[in-house]
């Protein structure tokens, strides 16, 4: 025989064809070979000009070799070599479907492995692709779309060699807030790790307001506006600076009371106040806690006290807010110029957690009089809030 | 309009014992602290015991502590002060005085007084 | 606790004349100073909260002012109704502590 070629080469199987010896032949002997693989031997009819190979070894590469018999008589060994395809992985599953999150596992192929190439893309078109590993079954996808229909594919990688894709379909969970308006929604869509989130005022996109979370404290879902930790930032600020917020929100810094006044009239708020210090701690909860708009002069609502550092937050109930630059306290002398910092002064302080950082000159620190008194500035402190519901929708959440 | 009518007042020997009341109307209760002062004859005034508007926080004087206690029904629009071991020091003319709201350390609305007299 | 000293104990004063009670702290306490007013045989009333604020209803002869350790009381013009007793009171720490008093009497 003459011409031996292999062609429809999978992973598992290969079709060997030869053009036929010019002589009439009783039959021809086919074998095949391959690394690690023991020869196999078959005789077909000397009328058959093909052969179906079958049971290959993925990613193998073989050599193939006919002769022709007639009688006793053999002719010349014709060889020809082939590699089979790499073959795919199996079963790909996703599991674990979130609203921005999925889980993918896999079987791997028969074949050895240097790697996999994961593809998933969305109904919309973003497509993305990543490289795992040759030991790896799993791969956990973030930062998908809520509500929204996936492919995710994979095909296993030897060098050079790329099996066939395989591929699942799936659909994540829609989010039950889409546009979170506090973090309390945030928590509620999943997210429980404490760090920086996007709110959306109203729930309306267009009002959007990058915010810290408190995921952990007390069931989490908590929006922290204050926090201080190191003295770092300046709080003895002016009224603007005040209206409007300062710091960074990793670190020190004051959320604003243009957005605690809209986040407060967004429903019914708590606040909570976390204060440490030289390993001690203390909190402060007041089941009621408002700030209204620049009319009132951000005027403070904060009622229902429980906790263990004292009800110091009740002296300041129903008052405006003061700085330097705009006296709203009941004081004869300015507070905020007094004590270096800002609040809802009266006349003045039971709390100044915009006091100066580590003074313990009497009412100039970071005081919360109850807790450490007047002359012992708190090392750190957080004021946050969250709806005063949230327990409510944390158990709907859970039963759903 | 806003009012406290104390009650409960009179002799009693030393050692023994007396329940003052205190009722309160023309304002939410619950929402404030309340507080009994005294004034002993001829003398000025002295703070005895407070307790929050929930009840839930109780203050006393060093003078009285452990043998007086406040309490209140707010239910009943009601706050009390139960006084044991009485001394004739405690001879004085006793307040019931409301908070302000707020801390409620300072007392907008005072009763007219009910008058205790410890003496053998 | 938190000694309120007032001075003086007693003010005999003409009907028109200004007045001028002084209350002093043992120690700091802001503006968490309160004044009242004691008729005799009637219930304290109070007229001065916050060290300046006037409670309402109460004439605006009557003024506060004061933020630390010193406060004063002042009446503007003494009128025959005025003659009293007048009492500062610290609300700043646990137990509320009271001055000893300030009799205004007709000079």
């Known amino acids: 025989p003459s011409g031996l070629v292999t062609a429809n080469i999978t992973d598992s199987e290969a079709l060997a064809r030869w053009q036929p010896a010019i002589a009439t032949v009783d039959s021809y002997v086919i074998s095949y070979t391959g690394e690690k693989v023991p020869e196999i031997t078959r005789t077909v009819s000397g009328n058959t000009v093909e052969y179906a190979l079958t049971d290959l070894e993925p990613a193998t590469e073989y050599t193939l070799r006919i002769f022709a018999e007639k009688g006793p008589q053999k002719s010349s060994t014709i060889t020809a070599k082939f590699t089979t395809d790499l073959d795919s992985p199996r079963d790909l599953t996703a599991t674990e479907v979130q609203s921005e999150t999925a889980l993918l596992t896999w079987r791997p192929p028969r074949a050895s492995v240097t790697g996999y190439l994961l593809v998933y893309e969305s109904v919309d078109g973003t497509v993305k692709e990543v490289i795992v590993g040759p030991d790896t079954t799993s791969y956990s996808l973030a930062d998908l779309s809520p509500s929204t229909h996936y492919t995710a594919k994979i095909q296993a990688l030897n060098g050079p060699l790329r099996s066939n894709m395989i591929q699942t379909i799936f659909t994540t969970i829609g989010l039950l807030y889409p546009f979170p308006k506090d973090c309390s929604q945030a928590m509620l869509n999943g997210d429980t790790t404490s760090g920086l989130y996007t709110i959306y005022l109203n729930g309306d996109k267009a009002e959007a307001l990058e915010v810290f979370c408190d995921m952990t404290s007390d069931g989490g879902g908590w929006i922290v506006f204050l926090r201080r930790k190191n003295g770092r930032e300046n709080f003895y600020q002016n009224w603007k600076a005040y209206a409007a917020g300062f710091g960074d929100r990793r670190e020190e810094f004051w959320l604003g009371l243009d957005n605690l006044n809209k986040i407060t009239a967004q429903g019914q708020y708590e606040l909570r106040v976390d204060l440490r210090d030289h390993g001690e701690t203390a909190f402060a909860v007041y089941d009621k806690f408002s700030v209204g708009d620049a009319k009132t002069r951000y005027k403070l609502k904060v009622e229902g006290y429980s906790g263990t550092a004292g009800d110091s937050m009740a002296y300041h109930n129903g008052r405006s807010f003061s700085t330097f630059d705009k006296d709203t306290d009941s004081a004869i002398t300015n507070c905020a110029l007094s004590y270096k910092g800002a609040f809802w002064y009266r006349n003045c302080h039971r709390v100044n957690l915009m006091g100066r950082y580590g003074d313990n000159n009497h009412s100039q620190g970071v005081n919360w009089f109850h807790w450490k008194g007047h002359e012992h500035s708190i090392q750190f402190a957080e004021m946050k809030l969250r709806p005063s519901n949230f327990r409510n929708l944390e158990g709907r959440r859970k039963r759903a | 309009q806003v009012q406290l009518v104390e009650s409960g007042g009179g002799l009693v020997q030393p050692g023994r014992s007396l329940r003052l009341s205190c009722a309160a109307s023309?304002?939410?209760?619950?929402?404030?602290?309340m507080h009994w002062v005294r004034q002993a004859p001829g003398k000025g005034l002295e703070w005895v015991s407070g307790?929050?508007?929930?009840?839930?926080?109780?203050y006393y004087a060093d003078s009285v502590k452990g043998r007086f206690t406040i309490s209140r029904d707010n239910a009943k629009n009601s706050l009390y002060l139960q006084m044991n071991s009485l001394r004739a020091e405690d001879t004085a003319l006793y307040y019931c005085?409301?908070?302000?709201?707020?801390?409620?350390?300072?007392?907008?609305?005072w009763g007219q007084g009910t008058m205790v007299t410890v003496s053998s | 606790d938190i000694q309120m000293t007032q001075s003086p104990a007693s003010l005999p004063t003409p009907v028109g004349d200004r007045v001028t009670i002084t209350c002093r702290a043992s120690?700091?306490?802001?503006?968490?100073l309160n004044w009242y007013q004691q008729k005799p045989g009637k219930a304290p009333k109070l007229l001065i909260y916050?060290?300046?604020n006037l409670e309402t209803g109460v004439p605006s002869r009557f003024s506060g002012s004061g933020s630390g350790t010193d406060f004063t009381l002042t009446i503007s013009s003494l009128q025959p109704e005025d003659f009293a007793t007048y009492y500062c009171?610290?609300?700043?720490?646990?137990?509320?502590?009271f001055g000893q008093g300030t009799k205004v009497d007709i000079k």
């Open positions: 005085a409301k908070g302000t709201r707020g801390e409620g350390d300072t007392f907008d609305i």
């Open positions: 307790i929050s508007g929930s009840g839930g926080s109780t």
């Open positions: 916050d060290a300046s």
């Open positions: 009171q610290q609300s700043y720490s646990t137990p509320q502590t």
């Open positions: 120690q700091y306490i802001q503006g968490f």
């Open positions: 023309g304002f939410t209760f619950d929402d404030y602290a």
